[in-house]
């Protein structure tokens, strides 16, 4: 990527934090080894990273949980990557599903998802979980960035 | 990205390559169907990726894992991607977590690991696994690489 | 990456179709939120990628299936990204190995790989798994993509 | 136990060249980046060069630049410093040394090897 | 270069007193939650010793009665109480970023 003002490096990468909220959407901070490339990307409101130009992305995020089979519901653990753009429907770009563990009192699993998509300026990323409460927050288990291209 | 020799393309993708040794460090290789682009990035004593340049990195790993929950210690199977950098503390850069399996003799499971981060020149990054020896070698199935942004 | 004429952004991302086809290898489609960035990365046959320029690739496949312990082969669940180049052999890239769920009648798991390679022009890159009939093919659970560095 | 020792200084023209080697023990030589730095005459602590484990990444400061290579053998756990167009204002004591495991600071020293530049 | 001004350059302390030790970064030392700032005890004739790293972590062996702290530009380091064998050169250094460099040492004499 040129250097220059006119193409500079866009990209952030966020790590997970814990949350009181009841929310399916997880929450990030810009904290520990962290990255934000300048302010052409946000993180908003602790929950979404948000593009001001228009074009492809590589968008990812990582999520590990701790379940059990038992103690859960029937559905599977599912990570969702969703998209919300001005003007337009909300959409899910990717999705991961792992069915929950045996292993007591719970079993670690890790989910990565990653993939690239057009943004136009203002576009908003967030991830979602079933539950959230599952999802483990230890150094660098969890974390969600993106690289325009 | 442009191909001129001040913003020359710098990525790598290495090869895992069954060790003797107990370091809970993964060795890799250049073989294979392995990517070095240039010397701005080296495979430094057959574990760790250093690179000569500051910039942004997209950088990831995949293991492939064989193991049993009866034959292992209860501790999931976990792997880091690390960072040492001359002058800093070490970081866990990115971890990921997967409860070992049921399955007899062992049950195969893979992990992908992937972010962007900041680094320093004569930063080296590198894999770390819980139990090297459960590691799959397999053609494609345990792989380190980065790219620079 | 420059914009120019010179060197145009090359990406593509495509999602997962089901096929009644017995092949094992995956069938993809440029529906939904998909990507392709211009005609110098096609989407040949709805099953392989394929570039018209050399250069390096970040190439990757994001898979989830569905299959049980006991319904499934003693095996596990292998996706598989491959690449065919003009007179060259036909080589794996990654792979990535998940045994089989115990839960009924069937438990998710998501598979992502995702590596940087040298691609010549004409290479075409597909997707290969043990049993497409497990694959998930709900909204953003299974897709394929690539972008050139 | 860490162990560093330098040996090769001496009395040189300026002009001259010499070169410095530390013997490295008590730990995994490959596994550190290495350093050296230089005390003048005044007591001015300055950081001379870096070189990376598996020695492939090297660095210095502007005014050594093009006059010193840092270089290693992970095979005999020997990191050397070599000198060239040597000036007055090179006099010093030049130390190795290592940082501690994944922390910062230089906290092995060996204990220096006396490099005279004079006429 | 990030230069670093140590004051003062020299300092007398009596037995059992504190002695504080100042070091000023011409820019930011601090990266991902660290400050990338050491201190060091020089010794006529012996290398420096590493005392603290990264701005306030005390180095293994070394006594307690060295502390340390600062963030961003400004950092201090103190020794309380000042014992007889504290006689010596003190040196800050930043690992923050290539070129690593030095205070130009404060010598402490115990009065």
């Known amino acids: 990527m040129q250097k220059g003002d006119q193409n500079p490096q866009i990209a952030a990468h966020v790590i997970s934090e814990a949350s009181s909220k009841t929310t399916s959407v997880l929450q990030w901070a810009e904290k520990g080894y962290y990255t934000m490339s300048n302010n052409l990307v946000t993180l908003e409101n602790g929950k979404q990273l948000t593009v001001k130009r228009q074009g492809l992305y590589y968008i990812y995020a990582q999520v590990t949980f701790c379940s059990n089979r038992e103690a859960s519901s029937q559905a599977p653990f599912i990570a969702s990557l969703c998209l919300k753009s001005p003007g337009r429907f909300e959409r899910i770009l990717l999705r991961a599903a792992n069915t929950h563990s045996s292993a007591k009192p719970c079993g670690q699993q890790s989910i990565h998802l990653g993939g690239v998509f057009e943004l136009q300026p203002g576009a908003s990323v967030f991830v979602n979980v079933t539950d959230p409460s599952q999802v483990s927050h230890g150094t660098g288990f969890t974390s969600f960035g993106l690289l325009k291209l | 990205m442009q191909k001129g020799d001040q913003n020359p393309q710098i990525a790598a993708h290495v090869i895992s390559e069954a060790s003797s040794k107990t370091t809970s460090v993964l060795q890799w290789a250049e073989k294979g169907y392995y990517t070095m682009s240039n010397n701005l990035v080296t495979l430094e004593n057959g574990k760790q990726l250093t690179v000569k340049r500051q910039g942004l990195y997209y950088i990831y790993a995949q293991v492939t894992f064989c193991s049993n929950r009866e034959a292992s210690s209860q501790a999931p199977f976990i792997a880091s991607l690390c960072l040492k950098s001359p002058g800093r503390f070490e970081r866990i850069l990115l971890r990921a977590a997967n409860t070992h399996s049921s399955a007899k003799p062992c049950g195969q499971q893979s992990i992908h690991l992937g972010g962007v981060f900041e680094l320093q020149p004569g930063a080296s990054v590198f894999v770390n696994v819980t139990d090297p020896s459960q590691v799959s070698h397999g053609t494609g199935f345990t792989s380190f690489g980065l790219l620079k942004l | 990456m420059q914009k120019g004429d010179q060197n145009p952004q090359i990406a593509a991302h495509v999602i997962s179709e089901a096929s009644s086809k017995t092949t094992s290898v995956l069938q993809w489609a440029e529906k939904g939120y998909y990507t392709m960035s211009n005609n110098l990365v096609t989407l040949e046959n709805g099953k392989q990628l394929t570039v018209k320029r050399q250069g390096l690739y970040y190439i990757y496949a994001q898979v989830t299936f569905c299959s049980n312990r006991e319904a499934s082969s003693q095996a596990p669940f292998i996706a598989s990204l491959c690449l065919k180049s003009p007179g060259r052999f036909e080589r794996i890239l990654l792979r990535a190995a998940n045994t089989h769920s115990s839960a009924k009648p069937c438990g998710q798991q998501s598979i992502h790989l995702g590596g940087v390679f040298e691609l010549q022009p004409g290479a075409s890159v597909f997707v290969n798994v043990t049993d497409p009939s497990q694959v998930s093919h709900g909204t953003g659970f299974t897709s394929f993509g690539l972008l050139k560095l | 136990e860490v162990q560093l020792v330098e040996s090769g200084g001496g009395s040189v023209k300026p002009g001259g060249s010499l070169k410095l080697s530390c013997a490295a023990s008590?730990?995994?030589?490959?596994?550190?980046?290495m350093y050296w730095v230089r005390q003048t005459p005044e007591k001015r602590l300055e950081w001379v060069a870096i070189?990376?484990?598996?020695?492939?990444?090297?660095s210095y400061p502007d005014s050594m630049k093009g006059r010193f290579t840092i270089s290693r053998d992970n095979a005999k756990n020997i990191l050397h410093l070599q000198m060239s167009s040597l000036k007055s204002e090179d006099t010093a004591m030049y130390y190795c040394?290592?940082?501690?495991?994944?922390?910062?600071?230089?906290?092995?020293w060996g204990q220096g090897t006396l490099v005279t530049v004079s006429a | 270069d990030i230069e670093l001004t140590q004051s003062p350059t020299s300092l007398a302390v009596s037995l059992g007193q504190r002695a504080t030790i100042s070091c000023k970064a011409s820019?930011?030392?601090?990266?991902?939650?660290?400050?990338?700032m050491n201190w060091y005890q020089q010794k006529p004739g012996q290398p420096p010793k590493l005392l603290i790293y990264?701005?306030?972590n005390l180095e293994s062996g070394i006594p307690a009665r060295f502390s340390a702290s600062g963030s961003g530009t400004d950092f201090t380091l103190n020794i309380h109480p000042v014992e007889e064998e504290d006689a010596a050169t003190y040196y800050c250094?930043?690992?923050?970023?290539?070129?690593?460099?030095f205070g130009g040492g404060t010598k402490l004499e115990i009065k």
């Open positions: 040394t290592r940082e501690s495991n994944g922390k910062p600071g230089f906290a092995y």
């Open positions: 990264a701005a306030s």
């Open positions: 250094q930043q690992s923050y970023e290539d070129p690593w460099t």
């Open positions: 070189i990376s484990g598996g020695g492939s990444y090297t």
């Open positions: 820019q930011s030392v601090d990266y991902a939650g660290d400050s990338y």
């Open positions: 008590g730990f995994t030589f490959s596994d550190h980046y």
